[in-house]
């Protein structure tokens, strides 16, 4: 399977909410011995390997934000912890999964990574990730609403092994 990032860049005004999205592509094994671990974290731009560094999003680690379920099942993060930080990650039946960040500030700017780990019981894991940039702006340079920029076809099927 692959992870697609429909948008590579989100430019948002301060105070706005944004939903960053990834999509699971390709054949997804729905067997009983397969579960999917999906999560989000921040990383540093300019790294040799994109998404190699895992940093918290608003003090929440990738463990705090993870979704753990089978195949294309729907799931949400534990509401209390994440929502206290203005965050919510979710997954639907169609392979889409997202993180919503509320009341953006300049310090939310950065590189965001979604990670999918296919866990086969008694077998090895298969990991893929996608990356996108969030630019939060304020003042005269800021758009009135979030503006999203589509990934190139090459970028949108980012299958870098983690």
């Amino acid at each position: 399977f692959k992870v697609a990032t429909p948008y590579s860049l989100y430019v948002c005004p301060e105070g706005q909410n944004v939903t960053l999205t990834c999509r699971l592509l390709g054949p997804v094994d729905k067997g009983h011995d397969v579960t999917f671990y999906k999560t989000w974290y921040r990383s540093s731009r300019g790294e040799v390997q994109t998404c190699s560094e895992r940093r918290p999003i608003r003090n929440l680690t990738f463990q705090d934000l993870h979704l753990h379920h089978g195949g294309h099942q729907a799931a949400n993060t534990s509401h209390d912890l994440a929502q206290r930080h203005g965050l919510e990650s979710a997954s639907d039946h169609h392979g889409n999964f997202s993180i919503t960040m509320r009341n953006l500030t300049l310090l939310d700017s950065g590189l965001y990574c979604c990670l999918v780990v296919e866990i086969r019981h008694h077998h090895s894991e298969h990991r893929v990730h996608g990356a996108m940039e969030l630019q939060v702006q304020t003042g005269k340079d800021a758009p009135s609403n979030c503006v999203v920029y589509p990934s190139s076809s090459q970028d949108s099927e980012n299958i870098t092994a983690a």
Epitope: R45, G46, R55, N59, S109, G110, E133
Partner: antibody, heavy 116, light 110 residues
């Protein structure tokens, strides 16, 4: 990877001055860059930063008098209406972690002296 | 915001431990956007700690940052002669206009 400031010199009050920060070994579209100054014998003072999209933000005291801009390999700090209070070493730094106060790579600084 | 540091100078013995406090007049962003720098006379600042407690690359583990919200501490254990310097805390805030450095704390090693 390196950062180096230039353009500091002795000027008279009211004279405009532009400082240039030249970077090598990394791309400015991947990093925020910050400007900080330090008056002789004093502490560090945050001036402002420019983000990966090219938008600049300033400390309230610097707004209107200082302008940060960039090219592909340089970041400029344009200063107007200089006073003796602006005498300081001016540092440019790479903000490694998308934070306007976390500079992981600093230049040696360039000295600006404002005197009549 | 105002960042108030331990008054200078602070004395430390070689091999000993020294702590420097940094108190912010308001909470830093996400309660952890605080950095610590070391600066020696005539030199550029050097990043030691970011996110309140994360060690910057190449910095010895003798340096430790702690704290959250408005109260932070930099602790240097097994103090070396080379640690003689001025140390600054720097806070990042949701409103960037509040960004500030502390006044600095000079550490003298005996």
């Amino acid at each position: 990877q390196s950062v180096e400031e230039s353009g500091g010199r002795l000027v008279t009050p009211g004279t405009p001055l532009t400082l240039t920060c030249t970077v090598s070994g990394f791309s400015l579209i991947s990093y925020w860059m910050i400007w900080v100054r330090q008056a002789p014998g004093e502490g560090l003072e945050w001036i402002g930063f420019i983000n990966t999209g090219g938008s600049a933000y300033y400390a309230s005291w610097a707004k209107g008098r200082f302008t940060i801009s960039r090219t592909s390999t340089t970041v400029d700090l344009k200063m107007t209406s200089l006073t003796t209070e602006d005498t300081a070493t001016y540092f440019c730094a790479r903000a490694r972690y998308d934070s306007y106060i976390t500079g992981d790579l600093w230049g040696p600084g360039t000295l600006v002296t404002v005197s009549s | 915001a105002v960042l108030t540091q331990t008054p200078s100078p602070v004395s430390a013995a070689v091999g000993g431990t020294v702590s420097i406090s940094c108190q912010s007049s308001k909470s830093v962003s996400d309660n952890n956007w605080l950095s610590w720098y070391q600066q020696k006379p005539g030199q550029r600042p050097k990043l030691l700690i970011f996110y309140a407690s994360t060690l910057a690359s190449g910095v010895p583990s003798r340096f430790k940052g702690s704290g959250s919200g408005t109260q932070f501490t930099l602790t240097i254990s097994d103090v070396q002669c080379d640690d003689a310097a001025t140390y600054y805390c720097a806070g990042a805030y949701t409103n960037y206009n509040d960004n500030a450095f502390g006044g600095g704390t000079e550490v003298v090693v005996k």
